[in-house]
């Protein structure tokens, strides 16, 4: 229904707290370099204006669209051109082009300092002094580093943060209470960020139809007792919510997400028997809980998929009369029977089925042609199953750090032209799949591994798009989203690469490495490992292991030495010589 004032409507629906949080996230995601204070000032102005519209919907400018209102605010920021360069050109455009322009200037890898968590006492003091400002800073800092973070979900993480601080700041040992809990929230939030970025990529590159297919598969796995009409409704609504968030329409997105959660809780009987626990929670927790609710028990008496989609004499007729619905029904039926498959795999199978029907329904004897289609799925299913087994075996053997290093070597060989920081970030993220997924029960491993890898590789593609350097990466990133992971897995050593010259300074270290936190130490060592591979792309695993063991031993010895600086300056060159010899 149309409202006289969109801003008043959203303010009333969302309430002041969520309204302000979402406006802050929106501004922080669009203008990523502005300080918290600059954005907080704008948020307050927008909120005050929204309140005047609530009081009188006919007041001046209350009938303007949210894009117009927010865009005008952003464009009024002083020194926009000096700080943001060509983004300022967006302000010469009219809506909707202006908003599209802002979206195109979102930076997936902004040059901002890492988000450092303050020391526990300082954090608790700030939080107690002004919890609202403290949480505002959290929203601002996360949103500007993750310009596509799912806004209503970021409000949920802020709420989690708030609860943890409230609890831990009352304890004697604040540090040991806060650290594990906040680390847990950070890990979950980072995964949420890459997953949402993947959804926005799907929407941006392939449109709503592609996202809706993803949603149908995912929802059918989770709610196998819902019928196709119910799944279609949920997928359509979920597509709208994600389209809005990916498009920067955060107030509409959060409002529609709340509506969807309400619908699901009012229609549990037709959706799933597992929703009640989620539905008893308050809004942000409810929506979060529903998004990761456990799979409902599969109906016991599902007929074989072949009956409707292979053996039926009218397959081609049914396909011709409503292609999207027929393929949607196939995807729904296949997905509800396979919670053990990844969404990416299910979409590849649906694509294969569609291609088979396109080909076979044009032939003289279609049933003879498409009769073997389910058997042809086998290699598509085996490939990711083997990937999971091989990688989980390797993870169990090496542990997370060793597994990351194995991936780093593999990916540096596949795409040695990619910058070392990007390769290290990607390998560290890809390597976490072991900890995240390999410990799960067998039937949950494949969906966990492949869908997580796909999201991480999407980030690799986004970073590579900014400065394309590898033909291998360009090839895999240009295809469809569901084919990316198999494409990257199939890449071998890039034979076109001319090895990097050996530079001693790349492998020269100083005593400051000794005081770094473990994570930073690992990154330094992994940076060296990537550089070694770039120098010798065809080095064997044994050669690389010898060098890395020697390197670890060198660090251990020098960091324990009484005179660390002398140790590093004398033993460092010896290490470099031994490395060169080992790789010769």
């Amino acid at each position: 229904e149309a409202h006289k004032s969109e801003i008043a409507h959203r303010y009333n629906d969302l309430g002041e707290q969520h309204f302000k949080g979402l406006v802050l996230i929106a501004f922080s995601q669009y203008l990523q370099k502005c300080s918290y204070d600059e954005h907080a000032k704008l948020v307050q102005e927008v909120t005050d204006f929204a309140k005047t519209c609530v009081a009188d919907e006919s007041a001046a400018n209350c009938d303007k669209s949210l894009h117009t209102l927010f865009g005008d605010k952003l464009c009024a920021i002083p020194n926009l051109r000096e700080n943001y360069g060509e983004l300022a050109d967006c302000c010469t455009k009219q809506e909707p082009e202006r908003n599209e322009c802002f979206l195109q200037h979102k930076d997936d890898n902004p040059s901002l300092p890492p988000f450092e968590r303050p020391e526990a006492e300082a954090m608790c003091t700030s939080f107690k002094e002004n919890p609202t400002t403290f949480m505002g800073h959290y929203l601002h800092e996360v949103a500007r580093r993750h310009p596509y973070f799912y806004a209503p979900e970021l409000l949920y993480y802020a709420e989690q943060y708030n609860e943890i601080l409230t609890q831990c700041c009352a304890e004697a040992d604040k540090e040991s209470c806060l650290t594990p809990k906040l680390d847990g929230v950070k890990e979950k939030a980072l995964v949420s960020s890459v997953r949402q970025r993947m959804k926005c990529s799907s929407m941006q590159k392939f449109g709503e139809r592609a996202f809706k297919a993803w949603a149908v598969a995912r929802l059918s796995q989770t709610f196998p007792n819902a019928d196709f009409a119910e799944i279609t409704k949920l997928a359509t609504d979920l597509t709208k919510v994600n389209k809005e968030c990916c498009h920067g329409d955060l107030l509409e997105c959060a409002d529609d997400r709340a509506e969807l959660a309400k619908y699901m809780c009012e229609n549990q009987a037709t959706i799933s028997s597992k929703l009640q626990t989620c539905c008893d929670k308050p809004l942000l927790k409810k929506a979060h809980c529903l998004s990761e609710v456990e799979h409902d028990t599969m109906p016991a008496d599902l007929p074989a998929i072949a009956a409707d989609f292979v053996e039926d004499q009218e397959v081609c007729k049914n396909y011709a009369e409503a292609k999207d619905v027929f393929l949607g029904t196939f995807l729904y039926e296949y997905s509800r029977r396979h919670p053990d498959y990844s969404v990416s795999l299910l979409l590849r199978l649906a694509k294969k089925y569609e291609a088979t029907l396109e080909k076979c329904c044009a032939e003289a004897n279609p049933p003879a042609c498409y009769g073997t289609v389910l058997a042809e799925f086998q290699p598509l299913v085996e490939e990711p199953k083997n990937l999971v087994k091989t990688n989980c075996d390797l993870y169990e053997k090496l542990g997370e750090y060793g597994f990351q290093n194995a991936i780093l070597v593999r990916y540096t060989q596949k795409a040695p032209q990619v910058s070392t920081p990007t390769l290290v970030e990607a390998a560290r993220n890809l390597g976490r799949v072991g900890t995240k997924c390999c410990t799960l029960p067998e039937d949950q491993r494949l969906p966990c591994v492949e869908d997580y890898l796909s999201a991480i590789l999407n980030r690799v593609c986004l970073l590579h798009e900014k400065t394309p350097v590898s033909e291998h990466v360009t090839k895999c990133c240009s295809g469809s989203l569901v084919e990316r992971r198999p494409c990257f897995s199939a890449l071998t050593v890039d034979e076109t690469y001319v090895p990097k010259e050996f530079k001693a300074e790349t492998f020269t270290f100083h005593s400051d490495i000794c005081t770094l936190p473990e994570k930073e130490k690992q990154i330094k060592k992994q940076t060296a490992l990537a550089e070694l591979v770039k120098h010798k792309p065809k080095a064997t695993a044994e050669q690389l292991k010898t060098v890395m063991d020697d390197f670890a031993q060198f660090l251990d010895t020098c960091c324990k030495a009484a005179d660390k600086d002398t140790c590093f300056s004398t033993e460092g060159p010896n290490l470099v010589t031994r490395c060169k010899d080992a790789l010769a």
Partner: nanobody, 118 residues
Framework: EVQLLESGGGLVQPGGSLRLSCTAS????????MGWVRQAPGKGLEWVSW????????YYADSVKGRFTISRDNSKNTLYLQMNSLRAEDTAVYYC???????????WGQGTLVTVSS
């Protein structure tokens, strides 16, 4: 093309019964949720009842619960509505509807008039 043909309407006394039928063609009947929608004189459309593709779940509006029964025969591409204990307020044109998405219908028939009057 999609066709839905209702039959079985008519004039009936309060407390009486009727059975509506709907024969479907032009689409894969067994893949779709089907339902009955009605429009009383001077009123809007309202969902009366719907049934899942496999017949395992049925929905009824509160106003007809316990009196109406929806069923389907996928082998005959036919939808039914058994209406018992009819009341004057059940007077309406009853439409058979095909639902592609929960809460919406994309096709419905010409309708059959049910008049409950003494």
């Amino acid at each position: 093309e999609v066709q839905l043909l209702e039959s079985g309407g008519g004039l009936v006394q309060p407390g009486g019964s009727l059975r509506l039928s709907c024969t479907a063609s032009g689409f894969t009947f067994r893949h779709y949720r089907m339902g009955w929608v009605r429009q009383a004189p001077g009123k809007g459309l309202e969902w009366v009842s719907w049934i899942r593709p496999d017949g395992t779940f049925t929905y009824y509006a509160d106003s007809v619960k316990g009196r109406f029964t929806i069923s389907r025969d996928n082998s005959k591409n036919t939808l039914y509505l058994q209406m018992n204990s009819l009341r004057a307020e059940d007077t309406a044109v009853y439409y058979c509807a095909k639902s592609y998405m929960a809460g919406t219908f994309d096709y419905w028939g010409q309708g059959t008039l049910v008049t409950v009057s003494s």
